[in-house]
Structure formats: structure tokens, C-alpha cells
């Protein structure tokens, strides 16, 4: 049995998958911050996790997915205020009893050192220094991401 938050996450991902393909993003839009091959948008308002998830979806983006410890550190370096927490795209799957990214993959236990409990209705936030498990109903800021399209050199066949 899926929790309401898991259902929301799956619904949003499916609706995103149904949308027509858009041309690749070569540069970050105005107001988005470039971090390597991603564009990040740090919210200025607060929301529970599922509203944050939905907001990113309306912006044709997703809640932040963090590949590894290195990407976490680089993202945290963009957070100047120690007291501010941001939702990312990771929550606890009750059915699988594991932390699950909104793209369907599971957390590699070595990637993030999470402070707090792994239990139902828990979602992950990051601060300047740490990664926390919070009640998903907690209203905090969030980070949306868009992937930049890598520019590949075109190879032309011999004429």
C-alpha cells in the first residue's frame, strides 16, 4: 500500500513522462543558478514536501536529485544561511522500507549521512552543513532542478 506522498510522487512523475519532449536546455533560465550540468532554483517561500514536489513539476523541473556526496557538498556551498532548510527529492518509502528518490531509485547508503529517523511520512531536507529527516508536512523551502543538455561536437560524415 502506497502512502499519499508516494502516490503524489508517482502521479507527478507519470504526468511529466507523458508530456511532449521539449528541446534541450543549453543555458540556465534567468533566476536559476547553474551548478555543473544542472540549473537550480532555490525557493523563497515555504511548503510541505508534496507541495514543493508539485511546484517543481509546474516549473517543468523536479525536486533536487543528488547523485553523490560531491554534488551534495557543491549544493550546500550555495546555501549561505545556516538556519535555512530545503526539501530535496528524497522521501521514505513505507512499502519498501527504504529512502527513495522521486525518479524511483533508492538511496545508496554511503551517499548521504541522514540525521533523524527513517520512518513513514519522513522526507529529506538539506542545510548548509547537514542532511535531515523531517516530517513531510513540515513547511520549509525547497530546491528545483533542471538538467542542462550537454553540447556534443557534431561529427560530420566525409562528403
Amino acid at each position: 500500500q502506497k502512502s499519499s506522498i508516494e502516490k503524489c510522487s508517482v502521479d507527478i512523475q507519470q504526468s511529466r513522462n507523458k508530456t511532449t519532449e521539449r528541446p534541450g536546455l543549453l543555458n540556465c533560465p534567468i533566476y536559476w543558478q547553474q551548478l555543473r550540468e544542472k540549473c537550480l532554483l532555490f525557493s523563497h517561500t515555504v511548503n510541505p514536501w508534496n507541495n514543493s514536489l508539485a511546484d517543481c513539476s509546474t516549473k517543468e523541473s523536479s525536486l533536487l536529485l543528488i547523485r553523490d556526496k560531491d554534488e551534495l557538498i557543491h549544493t550546500q556551498n550555495l546555501i549561505r544561511d545556516k538556519a535555512i532548510l530545503f526539501w530535496i527529492g528524497l522521501n521514505f518509502s513505507l512499502s519498501e522500507k527504504n529512502w527513495k528518490w522521486i525518479n524511483g531509485s533508492f538511496l545508496n547508503s554511503n551517499d548521504l549521512e541522514i540525521r533523524g529517523d527513517a520512518k513513514e511520512n519522513s522526507c529529506i531536507s538539506i542545510s548548509q552543513t547537514s542532511v535531515y529527516s523531517e516530517y513531510c508536512s513540515t513547511e520549509i523551502r525547497w530546491i528545483c532542478q533542471k538538467e542542462l543538455t550537454p553540447v556534443r561536437n557534431k561529427v560530420y560524415p566525409d562528403s
Epitope: 534567468i30 533566476y31 536559476w32 523563497h44 516549473k59 517543468e60 546555501i79 544561511d81
Partner: antibody, heavy 116, light 111 residues
Framework: QVQLQESGPGLVKPSETLSLTCTVS????????WSWIRQPPGKGLEWIGY???????NYNPSLKSRVTISVDTSKNQFSLKLSSVTAADTAVYYC??????????WGQGTLVTVSS | DIVMTQTPLSSPVTLGQPASISCRSS???????????LSWLQQRPGQPPRLLIY???NRFSGVPDRFSGSGAGTDFTLKISRVEAEDVGVYYC????????FGGGTKVEIK
């Protein structure tokens, strides 16, 4: 209530650098975007650029080669430098808080005259 | 650059009567995040600009409900339902789909 106040010299010589500072009170600069806008006497508004509190900037392409905007979060201030000024840079310079395209709080503006 | 064209240049209005200002952009103002960053500002004589409307139709806090915004894509309108003496000034539209640009301004004056 967020308040912004511009400060800096009112007279700058041609070819020199115009330097202005905006002090933010009643709210933290560690959020939102912070913009500079100018208005030549009797004319319309021109956006110069913004800075995000983490230090990333975006400038008007027509001014990009001459503009630098910086931020000092410890002082709740952000600053504008415009190099190689000419008489065409004479304007009232405003600082404003930029909530993604909504310039919701403005300073009173400061007139900068470029003249020898 | 996105060019913002405002009409009319000047709008003489009778107190208590409605006023309407049009703003047209040279290309669509739908940002790649799905929002339309079109705002309206009022500049009273000798004062800095003041935000009235953001994202097409959202009134900023403290703005009287006689001000309303509408439109989509490239065509936008600011309406004042009943003009009051304090509404005299220049009104600007502004886009932020790309680097921000302003319309040339519309002067609202009392007949």
C-alpha cells in the same frame, strides 16, 4: 517592512567608475535577488542587473562589459560599479528587491551626474 | 532583447472613470519554468516606482483592488476601474522572461 537606501557620490567624472551601495534593512539579504535599475532624467527605466545572495549575477547585455554587482551579506548590502562612464550614464539609480521579476521594494533613488 | 511596447503614451482620464493601459511584448513572456513574469509599476511624480501587479494579475500587498491586470502570451492590460487623484503618474510594464526590460511608460493624468 523591507527598506532599501542607496548611497554614493552624486558626481562622477567621465571615464571614471561610478560606485553605489544599497543597504537593506528590515529583512535579510540572504534570500531573493537584488537589482539595480536606472532612469535618465525625464526618461524611462532601464534594468542594469541583479545579484543573488550567493553571489551569482546577471547583467543587462548592453552594459555587461562595464558593470560589476557584488554583495556583502554580513553588512546586508549590495553594490554597483559602472566603469568608463559618459554623460549618457547620468541618471537616478535605484536599488530594488527582485522577487523573480517582481521588483517589490525600491530605494528612493540617488541622482548620479557624469560631468567634468 | 524583448521589446515592450505600451499604448497609449498618455491617457487623460476623468476622476471616477476607468482607465486601461496596453502592453505588448515582441515575443512570448512564458518563462521556461511555466510562469509569465509580467509586472506593472506605478511611478508618481518625484517618487521611485512602486509594484502594483506581478505575474500578470497578482496584486501586490497594499495595492487597491481598483487595479487589475490581465493578458497572456504577448498581450497584457492594466485596468484602473475608477481613477482617483492619487493614481496620477507614469505606469510601466516590465517583463522578466529573459533579462528584464520595461515598456516606455504611459502617463495617466486627470482631464
Amino acid at each position: 517592512q523591507v527598506q532599501l537606501q542607496e548611497s554614493g557620490p552624486g558626481l562622477v567624472k567621465p571615464s571614471e567608475t561610478l560606485s553605489l551601495t544599497c543597504t537593506v534593512s528590515g529583512g535579510s539579504i540572504s534570500s531573493y535577488y537584488w537589482s539595480w535599475i536606472r532612469q535618465p532624467p525625464g526618461k524611462g527605466l532601464e534594468w542594469i542587473g541583479y545579484i543573488y545572495y550567493i553571489g551569482t549575477t546577471n547583467y543587462n547585455p548592453s552594459l555587461k562589459s562595464r558593470v560589476t554587482i557584488s554583495v556583502d551579506t554580513s553588512k546586508n548590502q549590495f553594490s554597483l560599479k559602472l566603469s568608463s562612464v559618459t554623460a549618457a550614464d547620468t541618471a537616478v539609480y535605484y536599488c530594488a528587491r527582485d522577487r523573480m521579476g517582481a521588483l517589490d521594494y525600491w530605494g528612493q533613488g540617488t541622482l548620479v551626474t557624469v560631468s567634468s | 532583447d524583448i521589446v515592450m511596447t505600451q499604448t497609449p503614451l498618455s491617457s487623460p482620464v476623468t476622476l471616477g472613470q476607468p482607465a486601461s493601459i496596453s502592453c505588448r511584448s515582441s515575443q512570448s513572456l512564458v518563462h521556461s519554468d511555466g510562469n509569465t513574469y509580467l509586472s506593472w509599476l506605478q511611478q508618481r511624480p518625484g517618487q521611485p516606482p512602486r509594484l502594483l501587479i506581478y505575474e500578470i494579475s497578482n496584486r501586490f500587498s497594499g495595492v487597491p483592488d481598483r487595479f487589475s491586470g490581465s493578458g497572456a502570451g504577448t498581450d497584457f492590460t492594466l485596468k484602473i476601474s475608477r481613477v482617483e487623484a492619487e493614481d496620477v503618474g507614469v505606469y510601466y510594464c516590465m517583463q522578466a522572461a529573459q533579462f528584464p526590460t520595461f515598456g516606455g511608460g504611459t502617463k495617466v493624468e486627470i482631464k
